[in-house]
């Protein structure tokens, strides 16, 4: 969470952003809120990106003003126009690219004053892993697959029964580049699996951490997946 305040001139207003991460090829949200104003026509929202010459997005007098927008953001940005009046300046970014990562500034002008706050936006690829029993293998084997990750993650196996055990010598992980030549498919195989145990395949990079669990008993197989974004802290 980053809270910024206005500077000289008019009164300052509080602007708040939250660090976030975008999944390449999907839509993302850059969060920004501010002290609301009663008149929409008095609110100006400017989104800027460090290292980029043009604006990311501008909203003023109740509508988008995109004459100064940099072409790398052309047709890919939108604010939630109906929520600006209640202090939501968040930006929707369509078709997130790797190069959208960076430091953004949410700059607000209202009749009460000015304010801005920075936001660190990370981009990459992350997806839920699925763990299955590999019946094709010669011994009891688990196969953990996740279709899209970037940057290259680490993969660690754990088990409920053998807590703290190091499975690196009985597992094998590979990374296969996807067709767009950026993201990769993650495949990790765990050998010598015992029955009546719960195994976890944990995939992590600096953007996200995902876990795929599988519980193997004589009577059933239960699966569960979880993904958590690792937001960078305020600085």
């Amino acid at each position: 969470l980053i809270i910024g305040f206005g500077i000289s001139g008019r009164h300052s207003i509080t602007v708040t952003t939250v660090a976030s991460a975008g999944n390449i090829g999907e839509d993302g949200i850059l969060s920004c809120t501010f002290e609301p104003d009663i008149k929409l026509s008095d609110i100006v929202i400017q989104w800027l990106k460090e290292g980029v010459l043009g604006l990311v997005h501008e909203f003023k007098e109740g509508k988008d003003e995109l004459s100064e927008q940099d072409e790398m953001f052309r047709g890919r940005t939108a604010v939630f126009a109906d929520q600006v009046i209640v202090g939501n300046a968040s930006l929707r970014l369509k078709n997130v690219q790797l190069t959208d990562a960076g430091t953004y500034k949410c700059y607000i002008i209202t009749s009460k004053g000015k304010g801005n706050a920075n936001l660190e936006y990370k981009t990459g690829a992350f997806s839920m892993p699925e763990v299955n029993v590999d019946y094709n293998a010669s011994s009891e084997t688990l196969r953990c697959e996740a279709p899209r990750w970037f940057p290259q993650p680490t993969v660690v196996w754990a088990s409920q029964v053998d807590q703290g055990a190091n499975f690196s010598e009985v597992s094998n992980t590979s990374f296969e580049l996807n067709s767009e030549n950026v993201t990769m498919k993650v495949v990790s195989v765990l050998y010598n699996v015992t029955i009546n145990n719960t195994y976890s395949c944990m995939i992590e990079n600096d953007i996200a951490k995902a876990t795929g669990d599988i519980k193997v008993t004589e009577s059933e197989i239960k699966r569960r997946s979880h993904l958590q974004l690792l937001n960078s802290k305020a600085s």
Partner: antibody
Framework: QVQLQESGPGLVKPSETLSLTCTVS??????????WGWIRQPPGKGLEWIGT???????YYNPSLKSRVTISVDTSKSQLSLKLNSVTAADTAVYYC??????????????????WGQGTLVTVSS | DIVMTQSPDSLAVSLGERATINCKSS????????????LAWYQQKPGQPPKLLIY???TRESGVPDRFSGSGSGTDFTLTISSLQAEDVAVYYC?????????FGQGTKVEIK
């Protein structure tokens, strides 16, 4: 304050490979907001863009040099490097590394150079 | 490639007087969809690397004195130093960033008369 420092041999023989390194300090080369580039300036002449790289490794080269040039990045050392092979006397120049503040025109990443290294003179001679 | 041609090649101006440098591009660097001119100006003092002065043809880089100004559109651009100071002695380059490869003018040397 971002600082860039070029290093490498000052003398290269014709037909050999010119290799230079640029070390970035006061800011991370893996900053996702910036691109990095190489520009050269023959003695007493103007500036020529060689190429540009993003921290992920994406490269953009001047078509006139593309067949001979390789730019790479080592984010762990905060360095970018330039290799120019089959050099001739015409490659004698001061070589600069610089940070690129970008824009996009019709799908092409391009921009202005806002921070420069001091430059290193490379002479091609036997 | 877009060819950038500067004039004059050198210029001698008295201290406190106005210096004007011209830059012409072989094709327009004005992008009609956003009405921006993709042109920058740099200053290079002897033994130093170039320093960014102006981008978008007329936007001054942070920290650049306001005696430096840029103007023009399309193919014809001008860098003006309104009141020449001793520290302004340098070679000045224009650069287009409208199309790849980015290209520079041949430079204009500014001296004190």
């Amino acid at each position: 304050q971002v600082q860039l420092q070029e290093s490498g041999p000052g003398l290269v023989k014709p037909s050999e490979t010119l290799s230079l390194t640029c070390t970035v300090s006061g800011g991370s080369i893996s900053s996702s907001s910036y691109y990095w580039g190489w520009i050269r300036q023959p003695p007493g002449k103007g500036l020529e863009w060689i190429g540009t790289i993003y921290f992920s490794g994406n490269t953009y080269y001047n078509p006139s040099l593309k067949s001979r040039v390789t730019i790479s990045v080592d984010t762990s050392k905060s360095q970018l490097s330039l290799k120019l092979n089959s050099v001739t006397a015409a490659d004698t120049a001061v070589y600069y590394c610089a940070r690129l503040r970008v824009t996009m025109v019709r799908g092409v990443i391009i921009g202005v150079f806002d921070y420069w290294g001091q430059g290193t003179l490379v002479t091609v001679s036997s | 490639d877009i060819v950038m041609t500067q004039s004059p090649d050198s210029l001698a101006v008295s201290l406190g007087e106005r210096a004007t440098i011209n830059c012409k591009s072989s094709q327009s660097v004005l992008y009609s969809s956003n009405n921006k001119n993709y042109l920058a100006w740099y200053q290079q003092k002897p033994g130093q690397p170039p320093k960014l002065l102006i981008y978008w043809a007329s936007t001054r880089e942070s920290g650049v004195p306001d005696r430096f100004s840029g103007s023009g559109s399309g193919t014809d651009f001008t860098l003006t130093i309104s009141s020449l100071q001793a520290e302004d002695v340098a070679v000045y380059y224009c650069q287009q960033y409208y199309s790849t490869p980015p290209t520079f003018g041949q430079g204009t040397k500014v001296e004190i008369k």
